[in-house]
């Protein structure tokens, strides 16, 4: 995302469709309230930020409101009236998705159903990852809307489990973010726990008959 | 079979208007974005803008803001550009062509209008 | 404006020759950049999107590289349908084609 014009590196981040964050990190400007001017696609005059995020007390991003908006933010980043970055770019690419809400399990037997609220915009995938001490690594399972049934659990395991929200590259494009990740829910047989241990608890002898 | 079907050429006057028009068919005509192009041997392709003909939204190149307009007519699945105030710099070949959701390359392209500017 | 250059502006090759055309950006693009070639008298068909990825029903002879502001589609043993222009297009800001690389037979 990040030109390099006179140092200056950017990013931009729009958080789930409603409020994009434009940030800046230009070390020869390290200690210089930078200004940040902006207009969307079809808009004639630059507006200047209203809601600047400030880092050691000089500005250091914009926070801008843009509601859905399919279009394109004209920006420019001045030191006084000098332009130090100018730049154009489609607001989409750098849409993060909001953290899955409402996180409900359903377990039946060996199998798990995760859902969410989906969110109110498409082309997302709502992928659920879980794992349980014994295994070395994050097992993944992903769908097109918040409802995604994982089989094959061993009931008498611990399972850890979190959930996220990505958006589609063939729809948004490869720049853009995960959400976050959502907290980290632990389940055995069914019932909800603290956490799972850490180390797998040795299995229990079969008792013969 | 996806198809953009493009109207024939035109010839028209200097500071006059034309209307070229884009008939798709072979898929959901609202599902994807329709895009202008014009090709000349000035200054090869050049993107004109976008326009969603779910809800008739368009993006513009400034530089062809005052140019060209774009409009859809649903019922026909068709797309329609008009080019005003022609001078000979307009004369050029006018594609159009279709994207999916919001990653703006062109997966389908028309045949091409030619349009010739002269008095 | 985001400005694409594409080189060499000719390249002659004899078919079975493999080559490759450079598109540089002025500016940084992630990887924004798709691939197009056009015979002569007919409309531009998309050869690779995002830099490196294939599309379907595009020979395996094609392939792209590269990421920021330099890339480079590669053409593995030429055919003779691969003669005419070839193009680049960034959609990082408001969309930008490059002039063109033509390739003709030697």
């Known amino acids: 995302q990040g030109g390099a014009a006179e140092g200056v590196q950017i990013q931009i981040i729009y958080f789930n469709l409603e409020t994009v964050q434009v940030t800046w990190n230009a070390s020869k400007y390290s200690r210089t309230n930078l200004t940040f001017h902006y207009r969307f696609n079809g808009d004639e005059a630059y507006d200047q930020c209203t809601n600047y995020l400030l880092q050691e007390g000089h500005t250091s991003g914009c926070l801008l409101d843009a509601e859905q908006r399919d279009d394109i933010l004209y920006f420019s980043i001045r030191n006084g009236t000098h332009p130090v970055f100018t730049a154009s770019r489609w607001m989409v690419y750098y849409l993060k998705p909001s953290s899955p809400k409402h996180v409900r399990f359903s377990w039946h037997q060996d199998a798990v159903t995760v859902t969410c609220s989906d969110l109110s915009y498409g082309d997302l995938l709502y992928e659920v990852q879980y794992r349980s001490p014994f295994d070395t690594e994050w097992q993944s399972k992903q769908e097109n809307t918040c409802n995604v049934t994982i089989e094959g659990l061993d009931a008498e395991k611990c399972y850890s489990f979190w959930v996220r929200v990505k958006a589609m590259e063939d729809v948004y494009g490869p720049d853009t973010y995960p959400s976050d990740w959502s907290e980290v829910t632990c389940w055995q047989r069914g019932e909800i726990r603290d956490a799972c241990a850490e180390t797998p608890t040795p299995p229990k002898p079969k008792l013969s008959k | 079979e996806v198809q953009l079907q493009q109207s024939g050429p035109e010839l028209v006057k200097p500071r006059a208007s034309v209307k070229i028009s884009c008939k798709a068919s072979?898929?959901?005509?609202?599902?994807?974005?329709i895009h202008w192009v014009k090709q000349s041997h000035v200054k090869s392709l050049e993107w004109i803008g976008r326009?969603?003909?779910?809800?008739?939204?368009?993006i513009y190149n400034p530089n062809f803001k005052d140019k060209a307009s774009l409009t859809v007519d649903k019922s026909s699945s068709t797309a329609f550009m008009e080019v005003h105030s022609l001078t000979s710099e307009d004369s050029a070949v006018y594609y159009c062509?279709?994207?999916?959701?919001?990653?703006?390359?062109?997966?389908?392209w028309g045949q091409g209008t030619t349009l010739t500017v002269s008095s | 404006e985001i400005v694409l250059t594409q080189s060499p502006a000719t390249l002659s090759v004899t078919p079975g020759d493999s080559v490759s055309l450079s598109c540089r950006a002025s500016?940084?693009?992630?990887?924004?950049l798709h691939w197009y070639h056009q015979k002569s008298h007919e409309s531009p068909r998309l050869l690779i999107k995002?830099?490196?990825q294939s599309i379907s029903g595009i020979p395996s002879r094609f392939s792209g590289s590269g990421s920021g502001t330099d890339f480079t589609l590669s053409i593995n043993s030429v055919e003779t349908e691969d003669f005419g222009m070839y193009f680049c297009q960034q959609t990082n800001s408001w969309l930008t084609f490059g002039a063109g690389t033509k390739l003709e037979l030697k």
């Open positions: 062509a279709r994207s999916y959701g919001y990653v703006n390359y062109f997966d389908y």
């Open positions: 072979g898929y959901s005509f609202t599902g994807y974005y």
């Open positions: 995002f830099g490196f």
């Open positions: 326009i969603n003909p779910y809800n008739g939204a368009t």
């Open positions: 500016q940084s693009i992630s990887n924004n």
